[in-house]
């Protein structure tokens, strides 16, 4: 359903551990919205 990808994971971090903390669609949006901006992803200026 969602097409979000990361280039790398932090220490001791797994994709499963990230997803387990995102309990709702809004959490998912908030998490990746900031990631896109801070990492220059999406359509960063």
């Amino acid at each position: 359903k969602h097409k979000c990808f990361r280039n790398s994971l932090e220490n001791n971090e797994t994709l499963e551990s990230i997803m387990n903390t995102l309990e709702s669609e809004e959490d998912f949006r908030k998490y990746f919205y900031y990631l896109e901006g801070s990492k220059g992803g999406g359509g960063s200026k």
């Epitope: 979000c4 903390t21 995102l22 809004e26 959490d27 949006r29 908030k30 998490y31 990746f32 919205y33 900031y34 990631l35 896109e36 901006g37 992803g41 999406g42 359509g43 960063s44 200026k45």
Partner: antibody
Framework: QVQLVQSGGGLVQPGGSLRLSCAAS????????MSWVRQAPGKGLEWVSA????????YYADSVRGRFTISRDNSKNTLYLQMNSLRAEDTAIYYC???????????????WGRGTLVTVSS | DIQMTQSPDSLAVSLGERATINCKSS????????????LAWYQQKPGQPPKLLIY???TRESGVPDRFSGSGSGTDFTLTISSLQAEDVAVYYC?????????FGQGTKVEIK
């Protein structure tokens, strides 16, 4: 230059329909989520609707859900708002606005159109 | 929905003096997973669309004068104009983008005393 040019406002009777357009230039349109925000005369700002860069995901305020439809044509770099069953309380300046860094979701807005006035009155 | 409440509704400040606008959200807009506040500030002059000033509560948009600053966290936020200039006369709005529907404060009108 980077800009959003709006068209399509005007006077419409209650219950009528209107389609607003927002033509984008100066940036890769499909890379950004877009929104419509309105402002009733002399009042504050109200977020109305948003759409992802691909057009796959849409979002609406409760006040317009089921009456308004947001869409985009990335081949034409144009955003649309189809407004049906219009009410007097929909009278406002409608702005299109661009998200600064996300194609998937709207958030805040770094580029705005000049606005187009929609008046719903008999 | 998250309600945004600004205070005061209007304020008059002398040129060169400090202007402070407050914004309070009905629930926290701080996301614990990244410790970021999902809050933006805009300036709107008569007959013009809004202009983005601040996002993530305290990050100044490119090209915005450094006399504009944002602070706060959780539910309480402040926009400060450190030395008011004539061109700063406008209405200022806060906006939360923590959850949909995104909501704005009612606006604060800043005038010259």
């Amino acid at each position: 230059q980077v800009q959003l040019v709006q068209s399509g406002g005007g006077l419409v009777q209650p219950g009528g329909s209107l389609r607003l357009s927002c033509a984008a230039s100066g940036f890769t349109f499909s890379n950004y989520a877009m929104s419509w925000v309105r402002q009733a005369p002399g009042k504050g700002l109200e977020w109305v609707s948003a759409i992802s860069g691909s057009g796959d995901n849409t979002y609406y305020a409760d006040s317009v859900r089921g009456r308004f439809t947001i869409s985009r044509d990335n081949s034409k770099n144009t955003l649309y708002l189809q407004m049906n069953s219009l009410r007097a309380e929909d009278t406002a300046i409608y702005y299109c606005a661009k998200d600064p860094h996300s194609s998937r979701w709207p958030g805040f807005f770094d580029l705005w159109g000049r606005g187009t006035l929609v008046t719903v009155s008999s | 929905d998250i309600q945004m409440t600004q205070s005061p509704d209007s304020l008059a400040v002398s040129l060169g003096e400090r202007a402070t606008i407050n914004c309070k959200s009905s629930q926290s807009v701080l996301y614990s997973s990244n410790n970021q506040n999902y809050l933006a500030w805009y300036q709107q002059k008569p007959g013009q669309p809004p202009k983005l000033l601040i996002y993530w509560a305290s990050t100044r948009e490119s090209g915005v004068p450094d006399r504009f600053s944002g602070s706060g966290s959780g539910t309480d936020f402040t926009l400060t104009i450190s030395s008011l200039q004539a061109e700063d006369v406008a209405v200022y709005y806060c906006q939360q983008y923590y959850s949909t529907p995104y909501t704005f404060g009612q606006g604060t009108k800043v005038e010259i005393k």
